[in-house]
Amino acid sequence: QGWQAFKNDATEIIPELGEYPEPPPELENNKTMNRAENGGRPPHHPFETKDVSEYSCRELHFTRYVTDGPCRSAKPVTELVCSGQCGPARLLPNAIGRGKWWRPSGPDFRCIPDRYRAQRVQLLCPGGEAPRARKVRLVASCKCKRLTRFHNQSELKDFGTEAARPQKGRKPRPRARSAKANQAELENAY
């Protein structure tokens, strides 16, 4: 169930000036749908800098097979993994390890999934006669989003990774089927 590198494509996401990052989606651990809901925007930009090149949020492309029980998708699916830091580069740790994240009292920004898409996959099952299909929730884009101190770290867990059949849920359901819940819904569907 490991991730397989597909290519080293990395798209850098640069927040537009004047457009403030949003809080991360909240994960519903409800078997079927993990709906991502975006919260309100902060009243002001937390950084003094206007140099957008100091922000770095990359979309890494990976491929994986979707599995469900003993079944596996006929073809691998490609999705994005969000990577990188969202913040002025000058405030991030440097190679020597000096410096810190930005001021502790300030808001935290993370590179996390922004939009999702659903993709239907055909599953090949040993001994199976009927064609089986599932819909998987794949990350379609990443964004720097504001994480307030009230957000729990656990909310950032596994963003962008669809467990092998995550708990049943929405179209998404790769096999980790016990987690059916990961099936999170596709936010962009609404």
Partner: antibody, heavy 118, light 107 residues
Framework: EVQLQQSVAELVRPGASVKLSCTAS????????MHWVKQRPDQGLEWIGW????????EYASKFQGKATMTADTSSNTAYLQLSSLTSEDTAVYYC???????????WGLGTTLTVSS | DIVMTQSHKFMSTSVGDRVSITCKAS??????VAWYQQKPGQSPKLLIY???TRHTGVPDRFTGSGSGTDYTLTISDVQSEDLADYFC?????????FGGGTKLEIK
């Protein structure tokens, strides 16, 4: 919160048709498969079929071909089951249920009780 | 069509006991089996899929097992709220079919 809302009951004359609805909230039906299941009083469950609302693909149990027609309206996030040429054998509770696969059912509506009677 | 047979229409047990509900398929269904619980006046709820994988939020006292044609749902430490009908379902071959159900009664 995931919810599937169905009308509580329908009373229909023999020979007529009826269209049952299932409106989803908390998720987009395009990201799932919608299934319909029949349960007659004090009896077991019968799978009618599934529809992929995203593209209209359907699969029916042979028993229900010609009897049932599944459709979906993604703009209203609603799935429909139309039953035709109704007889007393069609009197049952009809459930809509959904999952990210075309083979098992994660969430269920409360069911619509269909009574066919003159 | 594949016939799913639940030989016991009724089973009686006591709180704290362990009970096993069986389901036999008319042909090999390759673990493509789910179990549902239906309480009186409610819609069914998924408990187990792929024969042994517990659905999210289902108490670990519910365990599924089996392969080939024989499948079992075991409830250990039965609770009063487990009073319900239990149905097995196969999704190996179309049409997906259900067992006739087993009603669990609490003494």
């Amino acid at each position: 919160e995931v919810q599937l809302q169905q009308s509580v009951a329908e009373l229909v004359r023999p020979g007529a048709s009826v269209k049952l609805s299932c409106t989803a909230s908390g998720f987009n039906i395009k990201s799932t498969f919608m299934h319909w299941v029949k349960q007659r009083p004090d009896q077991g469950l019968e799978w009618i079929g599934w529809i992929d609302p995203e593209n209209g693909d359907t699969e029916y149990a042979s028993k229900f071909q010609g009897k049932a027609t599944m459709t979906a309206d993604t703009s209203s996030n609603t799935a429909y089951l139309q039953l035709s040429s109704l007889t007393s054998e069609d009197t049952a509770v009809y459930y809509c249920t959904t999952g990210e696969s075309n083979y098992d059912f994660d969430f269920w509506g409360l069911g619509t009780t269909l009574t066919v009677s003159s | 069509d594949i016939v799913m047979t639940q030989s016991h229409k009724f089973m009686s047990t006591s709180v704290g006991d362990r009970v096993s509900i069986t389901c036999k398929a008319s042909q090999d269904v390759s673990t493509a089996v789910a179990w549902y619980q239906q309480k009186p006046g409610q819609s069914p709820k998924l408990l187990i899929y792929w024969a042994s994988t517990r659905h999210t939020g289902v108490p670990d006292r519910f365990t599924g097992s089996g392969s080939g044609t024989d499948y079992t749902l075991t409830i250990s430490d039965v609770q009063s709220e487990d009073l319900a009908d239990y149905f097995c379902q196969q999704y190996s071959n179309y049409p997906w079919t259900f067992g006739g159900g087993t009603k669990l009664e609490i003494k």
